[in-house]
Interface confidence: low
């Protein structure tokens, strides 16, 4: 099967945009050449991460491929098209009034994208309206070179934002994860994601989610009551993609949020998370920037214990070992801590109930000039059975009104050398962070100083 072309391809014309956006009137996605479609998939999944500068880890500890390197490599493989779903863009330092050498990797990425357009490779970007980066001109710069850009008015459509962070390259390769198109994501923020190479079935499934954003980026777009059949997914928690990843039997599927952006066959992101938690029998390890069993962006906030209850039920009802590692930075909302302490209070080793919560504090060091950085921004979970890599923080709004995606992967142990499954690799990364000196137990946190490194 192949992804049919969606019904409409108009280009959003933002008012007073200084660069020439008119290039965007042609289709953002051209079907791949038949020959390319017929190539046999040889799927490969690589975990990628960003470690903030000046955050040394113990020698010999496990690590993933550096995100910046992976992104540049992925662009090097591009031959026809690159589709990017992104919350916002801020790849250059002066976007945020910062002159810091650590922004150079972001600038290299912008340079690479400009070169890509020079090679007549189609670049289509679906980005959020509202956006965080009002001063960034990355997208105008790329549009001047021929990029197609659409702003998806999630604020108007669902009262949320487009919070997804994924790429589809040539309808074959994928990046998805916690990192925004932001130079800080490459050098100043702790991130985790996955790159999947040579996997057209999964890539073209994720492309359908990109296309849901794309069609909502035309003027006066409205959410369809029912999404047309060509947006439907063939892969979900009941019927995941089955394939060999580097020779290892693997199942995988993409989930999405909010429900309004889940066409037929697409597993909802919250449902995917709950399913992974529900199937765990030994452990659930999660690393998230924020954990709130409430709404975050509605006033007054509502209590929303769905994920909290699932973790409690797993620990209390099945004896599953639960570990939650939460981001802690200068911009962390301190009202989160009572919820974390409440969850940890359930722990009772004598009754075989194991719930541990730590915060991960990235020392600011001499990087205090860089706002909204030096934090663990990851959004992943791993059990003995599955790996979940997402784009959503853990509170209600991210699943009910905000656009995000998740990837659920399960690999068969025993079919390869020990330690090679994706879930085992992710567990090792989690345990590296959990046992590092930057992971601090809640007992060690004094109120009012919650997220300042005391090292």
């Amino acid at each position: 099967w192949q992804v049919p072309r969606p019904p409409t391809w108009g280009q959003v014309q933002p008012k007073d945009v200084p660069r020439s956006w008119e290039h965007g009137s042609s289709p953002a996605w051209e079907p791949l050449e038949a020959e390319a479609r017929q190539q046999r998939d040889s799927c490969q999944l690589v975990l990628v991460e960003s470690i903030p500068q000046d955050l040394p880890s113990a020698a010999g500890s496990p690590s993933a491929q550096p995100l910046g390197q992976a992104w540049l490599q992925l662009l090097d493989t591009a031959q026809e098209s690159v589709h990017v779903a992104s919350y916002y863009w801020s790849l250059t330092g002066p976007d945020i009034g910062v002159n810091d050498s650590s922004s150079q990797l972001g600038e290299a990425l912008l340079q690479k994208l400009q070169q890509l357009l020079g090679r007549n490779i189609s670049l289509a970007v679906a980005t959020s309206s509202p956006t965080l980066a009002r001063t960034s001109t990355d997208l105008q710069v790329l549009a001047a070179r021929g990029a197609h850009v659409r702003q998806v008015p999630m604020g108007r459509l669902t009262r949320g934002v487009l919070h997804s962070k994924f790429w589809v390259v040539d309808g074959r390769h994928i990046y998805m994860g916690s990192a925004n198109m932001d130079w800080r994501s490459l050098t100043q923020v702790k991130e985790l994601g996955a790159v999947i190479y040579n996997c057209s079935h999964l890539a073209q499934d994720l492309e359908k989610t990109f296309q849901t954003y794309w069609v909502l980026g035309v003027p006066k777009a409205v959410l369809p009551k029912t999404w047309p059949q060509n947006f439907s997914s063939h892969f979900n928690r009941f019927q995941p993609f089955h394939g060999l990843f580097d020779g290892v039997p693997t199942t995988a599927y993409f989930s999405a949020s909010p429900p309004a952006l889940c066409p037929q066959g697409r597993t909802r992101d919250l449902e995917a998370l709950l399913a992974v938690m529900g199937s765990a029998q030994e452990f659930i390890y999660a690393s998230v920037m924020e954990y709130f069993p409430t709404t975050r962006f509605s006033h007054p906030p509502r209590y929303w214990p769905v994920l909290d209850n699932a973790l409690r039920a797993a620990a209390f009802g099945k004896g599953v070992r639960v570990r939650l590692l939460v981001g802690c930075g200068l911009n962390t909302d301190p009202t989160m801590f009572p919820y974390l302490r409440s969850l940890q209070a359930l722990s009772n080793p004598a009754a075989n109930v194991s719930v541990d919560v730590k915060v991960f504090i990235v020392p600011v060091g001499n990087h205090s000039n860089i706002p909204f950085s030096r934090v663990n921004h990851s959004k992943f979970m791993v059990t003995e059975k599955a790996a979940y890599i997402g784009t959503s923080n853990w509170s209600e709004d991210y699943f009910s009104s905000t656009a995000g995606v998740g990837l659920v992967v399960t690999q068969s142990p025993g079919a390869q050398p020990a330690g090679a499954t994706v879930q085992e690799q992710l567990r090792q990364l989690f345990e590296r962070d959990w046992s590092s000196r930057y992971a601090v137990g809640l007992d060690g946190q004094a109120p009012g100083q919650d997220c300042v490194w005391q090292g």
Partner: antibody
Framework: QVQLQQPGAELVKPGTSVKMSCKAS????????MHWVKQRPGQGLEWIGD????????NYNEKFKSKATLTVDTSSSTAYMQLSSLTSEDSAVYYC???????????WGQGTSVTVSS | DIQMTQTTSSLSASLGDRVTISCRAS??????LNWYQQKPDGTVKLLIY???RLHSGVPSRFSGSGSGTDYSLTISNLEQEDIATYFC?????????FGGGTKLETK
């Protein structure tokens, strides 16, 4: 190191055309835009257009669209600009410059001085 | 097209002086402002890109600042080798455009 070599001068007759070269070395020629810039005697700089050697993709300043044609020969890492229907207004120094970080022109040739005279 | 204006076409200063050259764009160019130095022999060099980024090999006495429509190049301690003409250029909207230049001379 990055170098852009241009011939020093061209003397041409009105109504004819001239094709000037810019030989690049010290970097991957196909990965960077090549800009062309005009400077009339005692005047400022005017951007003519640019070309991406990896695909022959071009952008032109509207003012020079019917005057200049940009091409490349990737086998010799050389960029060319042809100016047609020459008049005295075309007498100027023409620079090639590599498009580097964020479209800044980071390395420049020495310039080719074109004199249009009968 | 975006017009770039360098109001001072020539400037006299003494060696060791702090010199500031300004440049104004006809509309917001979002920091996509580059500065070039042209020596009397015609040689052109990039000094500053993206408002404030020093190009490799450029002495640290050169610095750039600005935002929106107004930008400036500062030479903190003028040296003889800095005697040249300085051009600003916007890289925000095609076609790229240059200012008319500011010729720096010694008193």
């Amino acid at each position: 190191q990055v170098q852009l070599q241009q011939p020093g001068a061209e003397l041409v007759k009105p109504g004819t055309s001239v094709k000037m070269s810019c030989k690049a070395s010290g970097y991957t020629f196909t990965s960077y835009w090549m800009h062309w810039v005009k400077q009339r005697p005692g005047q400022g700089l005017e951007w003519i257009g640019d070309i991406y050697p990896g695909s022959d993709s071009t952008n032109y300043n509207e003012k020079f669209k019917s005057k200049a044609t940009l091409t490349v020969d990737t086998s010799s890492s050389t960029a060319y600009m042809q100016l047609s229907s020459l008049t005295s207004e075309d007498s100027a120094v023409y620079y090639c410059a590599r498009g580097g970080w964020l479209d800044a022109m980071d390395y420049w040739g020495q310039g080719t001085s074109v004199t249009v005279s009968s | 097209d975006i017009q770039m204006t360098q109001t001072t076409s020539s400037l006299s200063a003494s060696l060791g002086d702090r010199v500031t050259i300004s440049c104004r764009a006809s509309q917001d160019i979002s920091n996509y402002l580059n500065w070039y130095q042209q020596k009397p022999d015609g040689t052109v060099k990039l000094l500053i890109y993206y408002t404030s980024r020093l190009h490799s090999g450029v002495p640290s006495r050169f610095s750039g600042s600005g935002s929106g429509t107004d930008y400036s190049l500062t030479i903190s301690n003028l040296e003889q080798e800095d005697i040249a003409t300085y051009f600003c250029q916007q890289g925000n909207t095609l076609p790229w455009t240059f200012g008319g230049g500011t010729k720096l001379e010694t008193k």
